[in-house]
Structures are given as C-alpha cells and as structure tokens.
Amino acid sequence: GSERTCCPVNWVEHERSCYWFSRSGKAWADADNYCRLEDAHLVVVTSWEEQKFVQHHIGPVNTWMGLHDQNGPWKWVDGTDYETGFKNWRPEQPDDWYGHGLGGGEDCAHFTDDGRWNDDVCQRPYRWVCETELDKASQEPPLL
C-alpha cells in the first residue's frame, strides 16, 4: 500500500488524522462509498477532543459518521470497538424508531445540530465527514 505523510488539498489535519467535510448530502451508504474512494472512511470518533473538533467544523447540521447497526450490533466502520469506545448519544438515543413511516428502523448514526448523536434512517441525505490516518499504509477497508 501507499503511505500518507500529509493531508490532501482541502482536508484538515488534526492529531495525525486528515478530515474532509462534505458540502452536499448523501445517504449513509453513498457517503461511505465516497470516503472509501478517497482511501478513507466515514469519521470514527474516539474521544471527546475529536468530537469537539468535528463539531466545530460541521456546525449545527445533521452529519453522518462511520457508525451503524445495519447488521445487528453497533459497529464503527474501521473496526474500533463500540462497546468500550467513546459515545455521545442524545438522551434516549439510539432508539431505532419505526415511527417515521419510511420502513424499518434507524440504523445509522449522525451528529445532530448540537453535536450529540442520533440514530436515523440511513437513506436520509445528510452531509458527511471522511477521515484517514496519517503515517498509516493504505489497506483494504473492513467489510461492513
């Protein structure tokens, strides 16, 4: 694989990672594909410090992150352990709400207008954030 030593143009470097913030909206799976085609992944939030950094850049806008439970348990797209990791859900979330009338529950996580997390219908066209780590050889992305 190839090694990244600096962030691409228009990406923001922070704590040895590079972040890219979309201007438009996509369904979660399409946003996931987009990041993968940048040899990156949807943002994985591992600390309060990283949460604040991302929140500062996205503002009060619903924005997808790399967390979903489409196959059962909640999983981060890069394999980071969900159970022991950082979480910032809104009160009473995630709730897998079925009342939206769109079919199914809510399997994809996003930042809400106050930065805290909510689970929502994966087809909603939200903005998204890609992340890639510096000094780490590119490798095949993990399967969902």
């Epitope: 691409p8 228009n10 987009y34 993968r36 085609l37 040899d39 590119s138 992305p141």
Partner: antibody, heavy 123, light 107 residues
Framework: QVQLVESGGGVVQPGRSLRLSCAAS????????MHWVRQAPGKGLEWVAI????????FYADSVKGRFTISRDNSKNTLYLQMNSLRAEDTAVYYC????????????????WGQGTTVTVSS | DIQMTQSPSSLSASVGDRVTIACQAS??????LNWYQQTPGKAPKVLIY???NLETGVPARFSGSGSGTDFTFTISSLQPEDIATYYC?????????FGGGTKVDIK
C-alpha cells in the same frame, strides 16, 4: 501534457478473457482515482468501474460485477481492466478516464479521457 | 440507479442559431453534472462540469445551467465545428449514469 493511452483491445471469443491497460503520463497518477467507461457500437456511454487512488477501493456496474476487475500499478503509472467470461454485449470501445481531484470537483467526476481501445467479442 | 433523460435525441439547426438541450435526473443530484461533446471516432470531451462551469479552453458559446433534477445545455451561436453528439452525465452517486445523447447537425 496529460495523456491516457489504452491498449490491449482485440477480437476475442465469448467466454474468454482479455486485459486492457491504460498508460498515464503528464500528471501524478498515484494521486487520482480512475474510471473505465465503454461505448458499444452506435450506442451511448456506459460507466464500467472506478478505483481509488491507492487502489484499495473499487466499485463496478452491475453489468460487469463478478466478471471484470479494475486494478492499478502506481509504480508503473498504469490502470488495468481484467475482463473475464466475456459476452457479445461487452463489445465496445473502452475508455480510461481520470477522476478530477476532489478539491476541484466534489463527486465522482471525469475530466481526462483516453482515445479508447476496441474490444470485439465474437465467435 | 439515477436515470438521466436527455431531450431531444437529435436536432438540426442553422449556423448562428441558439441550441438548447435538456437533461433531467430521476432524483436530486445537486450540481454534479457534466456535459460532453463527442465527434465520430473520438473520445468524449468535457465541456461543462458542476452543471455550469466551463472547462478550460472551451469556447464561451457553450454554457450550462440547472441544479437538482433539471439541467440545460446551450450553444449560443451554433458553429459548423459543433456538429457532434452531446451527453449529460451525473456524478453524484454510483453507478455513474449518462443521458442517451443528443445528435446535433446543421440544417
């Protein structure tokens, strides 16, 4: 100048394989995603596949999924399309196309096209 | 998949005429649209990207507009060298899809 030159086309029997190559020059190949696009005789354009700049991520049109494989060798500035189990409907001119840099065009755009190489699948 | 419907499929116009081609997407694609020109035996050439941005070196008589689902491509004053087939293409989501093409010729 920026250039993409395809090769490897030819006449092949149904069920057989063929590998197309695309030699890139005039730009930093390893910094760009790449596409293959095809055009059947007298028909419109059809997207075939895309690969990320480091080659770790690939996506395909349903019509070629499981039969075609896109790959790249950044040390040789070359893009490939391995075509297996070829069918008559794969007969087309195949174009190698560069994806513009993300800072210029958000999305899966196309900017520079090669001249194309012709693949004919016939018994 | 996003369907791209282009109209008309062909047109004839006189030199100097204003020519307009429409392209409709089956769902919102924001401004992620290219317009291409293809002459026989040649590769397509990008004229317009992001729906309305003129590619470097392309004459100013070509223009594009629109956002969301409805897009328009215009040649303000048709020239003999503009005889070609024109395609729209969305690059918002995979699979990438093209319009069926519009063949432009001179009356």
């Amino acid at each position: 100048q920026v250039q993409l030159v395809e090769s490897g086309g030819g006449v092949v029997q149904p069920g057989r394989s063929l590998r197309l190559s695309c030699a890139a020059s005039g730009f930093t190949f390893s910094s760009y995603g790449m596409h293959w696009v095809r055009q059947a005789p007298g028909k419109g354009l059809e997207w075939v596949a895309i690969i990320s700049y480091a080659g770790s991520t690939k996506f395909y049109a349903d019509s070629v999924k499981g039969r075609f494989t896109i790959s790249r060798d950044n040390s040789k500035n070359t893009l490939y399309l391995q075509m297996n189990s070829l069918r008559a409907e794969d007969t087309a001119v195949y174009y190698c196309v560069r994806r513009p840099p993300q800072w210029l065009v958000e999305g899966y755009g196309m900017d520079v096209w090669g001249q194309g190489t012709t693949v004919t699948v016939s018994s | 998949d996003i369907q791209m419907t282009q109209s008309p499929s062909s047109l004839s116009a006189s030199v100097g005429d204003r020519v307009t081609i429409a392209c409709q997407a089956s769902q919102d694609i924001s401004n992620y649209l290219n317009w291409y020109q293809q002459t026989p035996g040649k590769a397509p050439k990008v004229l317009i990207y992001d729906a309305s941005n003129l590619e470097t070196g392309v004459p100013a008589r070509f223009s594009g507009s629109g956002s969301g689902t409805d897009f328009t491509f215009t040649i303000s004053s048709l020239q003999p060298e503009d005889i070609a087939t024109y395609y729209c293409q969305q690059y918002d989501n995979l699979p990438l899809t093209f319009g069926g093409g519009t063949k432009v010729d001179i009356k």
